[in-house]
Every structure is written in structure tokens, then in C-alpha cells.
């Protein structure tokens, strides 16, 4: 006699009997005999199980706290759970997305690289010379340096990675 | 490859008795669930009965409880029906079958032999 | 006993044609249900289990759905070898019982 000790894709072994797994959104009841398959009960509402499976319980859809910060970005299923994400300004804190912080800013002198979303924060960068920004933001990126040039005017005070350059009237040759 | 080859069958009175066997090749036959299933002329598929992979426990379809007895010898890879007090509603062909999966009376049958008959008249 | 109940009980089709078969079953049983195809004087032949899962070497053109009462297996296009009589199987619980048979034959 060879009892089982290895069962099929979607079977679980107990008591030497290869059993029948709950499929995705069903939890199980009670483990298969020689008489009966395996029992399962779809999960409730607000409950989800997500994979094949011989829980005896579903776990609950997350909860998405507004006084977290956090919104309903996909309503979960019986057999997916909640996904949040944060309101508009706030990302998450970790990819699980517990709770939100507020969008950070780029200081002046640097400017928004990647505009943040509900999951990433803001990425900001240094102004390149020639570049620059004189605000604390969240959207604005480094603007380049005015061309006194194309104004027909000179440049009187250079430009700084916060500060455009200040352009004027060219000198005049006296006659 | 994996054979079932049934014998056993013919001519029985009602009232008679006959064993049918099923010779089995090609798997490892100490590991499955085995049935027998039967097939009157022109009708549809009747479980009949099945057993454990090692012989330690059966279930048996009411319509043959307590008539008919399955039972195997895993050492020549054999399974058996031994068929009692048969009646003419008997009359069928009796295939065994290999359970698809490990445990249960229950499971889909995924391998057949090509069967045997029995017929039950006077 | 669990009854099966198969429809139609016989149908005709022609080749390249998409043909559907039902089976319900007296009660709930989840998704334990199993197809096979029978050809005359031949043995039945597994062909879908657990209501979907198609058994090792049976064509893609054969596929089952369904879950609780209601199962269906569907032959999206018909070839010459699939006209044969068809049944269904719930392996819920002993004993196993069979539907009375669906004969798909040649229009």
C-alpha cells in the first residue's frame, strides 16, 4: 500500500488524502473525506481570499482611513483586496500605503523633476546653470535663465541657480 | 502507457455469480483509488462501486450493496468485482477505471479499460 | 444521490460548427464536474475536470465552465472525430453520478 505524499496542483494532503483546494474568494468549511469533496463558503462581504487555499477564515478588504489621508482607489472583491491610495497633494508612505504625507516641495535653486502621484514622492533637482528657480514648489520645474540677447539687451546682473538674470539697455556710443 | 484489461464476463442465470477482474499496467497501481463502472446496453454510465488504494476501505452504489464485493491484490496489480445474487438489471458492460487523483470514491475517472459484458438471463 | 440532468439529450451539428452542452445538478456542487466523451463499442474518455480543467492531451477546442447547479461544456468548433455521445460527471460526493448522456451526431 502507497499512500499519497505529494498531491496535484490545486490539492492540499491531509490525513493521507489529497484534498481539493478553496478556489480564489472561498474559504474552507471542512477538508474532503473519502466520501465528500472538500467544502468551501464564498467569503462575505468585505472579505476577500485571493489565492487557491485551506483558510478556514477570508481575510478583510483594507481600509482605506480618510483621517490618514487615504482614499478608495480600487473597491476590493471577494477575491482582491481594497487598494488605497492617498488625496490629492498626500502620496503614500510605503507601497502597502498605510498612510499619506503631503507632497514635498523644491526649495528654490531646485526644481521638480518627477511631479509627485498618490504612491511617489515629489523628485526635485538641482537648477543646471543657465537654469532656475525662485519658488518653493511642488509642480514648478527650473526655468532657463532669460535671453537678454534675443531682447536686444544686455545682461546686467549674471543669473543664479534661484535668481534670472537681470537684462538692460545697452550702452550708447556718444557721438 | 497505462492498461486496464477486464475479464470475467459472459452468460450468468439470475440468482448466479461471477468475478470479474482487472489486470493493470503501465502506473503504479498501489497508489490509486480504483472503480468499477457499468453500462447497460444503450444506456447511460452507472458507478458500481470503489476502493482505496490499499484495499481499506469500499463504497458501493445501493443497487449493488450488499451483492457485490470489490476488493484488489496491489502484489499482482489486479482489481476484482465479485458479482452475487445477480439480477437481470445487471446486465451491462462492467469497465474498471483508475481514480485521476489520490483519495475519494467520488473522483473523475481518467483512465478506462475497454470493459467486459455480463448478461443476466435465463 | 445527487441527481445529473443533461440538455439536449441529442443534437445535430456540422463540422466547424460551435456546439453547447448543459448539465445541472439537483443540488450544489461547487465546481466538481467532470466531462467525458464516449464513441460507440469504445470506452468513455476524461475530458474536463473541476468544471474547467482541461485533462492532459484533450484539444483546446474543448472547454467547460460553470459552478454550483449550472456547468456547461462547449466544443468551439466541431471536428469530424468529436461526434460521439457526451456526459456529464459531479465529483462532489460518493456516490458519483452521471448525467443520462448528450449524442452530438452529424447533421
Known amino acids: 500500500p502507497e499512500p499519497p505524499t505529494a498531491c496535484r496542483e490545486k490539492q492540499y494532503l491531509i490525513n493521507s488524502q489529497c484534498c481539493s483546494l478553496c478556489q480564489p474568494g472561498q474559504k474552507l468549511v471542512s477538508d474532503c473525506t473519502e466520501f465528500t469533496e472538500t467544502e468551501c463558503l464564498p467569503c462575505g462581504e468585505s472579505e476577500f481570499l485571493d489565492t487557491w487555499n485551506r483558510e478556514t477564515h477570508c481575510h478583510q478588504h483594507k481600509y482605506c482611513d480618510p483621517n490618514l489621508g487615504l482614499r478608495v482607489q480600487q473597491k476590493g472583491t471577494s477575491e482582491t483586496d481594497t487598494i488605497c491610495t492617498c488625496e490629492e497633494g498626500w502620496h503614500c508612505t510605503s507601497e502597502a500605503c498605510e498612510s499619506c504625507v503631503l507632497h514635498r516641495s523644491c526649495s528654490p535653486g531646485f526644481g521638480v523633476k518627477q511631479i509627485a502621484t498618490g504612491v511617489s514622492d515629489t523628485i526635485c533637482e538641482p537648477c543646471p546653470v543657465g537654469f532656475f528657480s525662485n519658488v518653493s514648489s511642488a509642480f514648478e520645474k527650473c526655468h532657463p535663465w532669460t535671453s537678454c540677447e534675443t531682447k536686444d539687451l544686455v545682461v546686467q546682473q549674471a543669473g543664479t541657480n534661484k535668481t534670472d538674470v537681470v537684462c538692460g539697455p545697452q550702452d550708447r556710443l556718444r557721438a | 502507457e497505462v492498461q486496464l484489461v477486464e475479464s470475467g464476463g459472459g452468460l450468468v442465470q439470475p440468482g448466479g455469480s461471477l468475478r470479474l477482474s482487472c489486470a493493470a499496467s503501465?502506473?503504479?497501481?498501489?497508489?490509486?483509488?480504483m472503480s468499477w463502472v457499468r453500462q447497460a446496453p444503450g444506456k447511460g454510465l452507472e458507478w458500481v462501486s470503489a476502493?482505496?488504494?490499499?484495499?481499506?476501505?469500499?463504497g458501493y452504489a445501493d443497487s449493488v450493496k450488499g451483492r457485490f464485493t470489490i476488493s484488489r491484490d496491489n502484489s499482482k496489480n489486479t482489481l476484482y468485482l465479485q458479482m452475487n445474487s445477480l439480477r437481470a438489471e445487471d446486465t451491462a458492460v462492467y469497465y474498471c477505471?483508475?481514480?485521476?487523483?489520490?483519495?475519494?470514491?467520488?473522483?473523475?475517472?481518467?483512465?478506462w479499460g475497454q470493459g467486459t459484458l455480463v448478461t443476466v438471463s435465463s | 444521490d445527487i441527481q445529473m440532468t443533461q440538455s439536449p439529450s441529442s443534437l445535430s451539428a456540422s463540422v466547424g460548427d460551435r456546439v453547447t452542452i448543459t448539465c445541472r445538478a439537483s443540488?450544489?456542487?461547487?465546481?466538481?464536474l467532470a466531462w467525458y466523451q464516449q464513441k460507440p463499442g469504445k470506452a468513455p474518455k476524461l475530458l474536463i475536470y473541476?468544471?474547467?480543467s482541461l485533462q492532459s492531451g484533450v484539444p483546446s477546442r474543448f472547454s467547460g465552465s460553470g459552478s454550483g447547479t449550472d456547468f456547461t461544456l462547449t466544443i468551439s468548433s466541431l471536428q469530424p472525430e468529436d461526434f460521439a455521445t457526451y456526459y456529464c460527471?459531479?465529483?462532489?460526493?460518493?456516490?458519483?453520478?452521471f448525467g443520462q448522456g448528450t449524442k452530438v451526431e452529424i447533421k
Open positions: 460527471q459531479q465529483h462532489y460526493t460518493t456516490p458519483p453520478t
Open positions: 477505471a483508475r481514480a485521476l487523483y489520490y483519495t475519494g470514491f467520488y473522483r473523475p475517472l481518467d483512465y
Open positions: 503501465g502506473f503504479n497501481f498501489g497508489g490509486y483509488y
Open positions: 473541476a468544471a474547467s
Open positions: 476502493i482505496k488504494y490499499d484495499g481499506g476501505s469500499t
Open positions: 443540488q450544489g456542487i461547487s465546481s466538481y
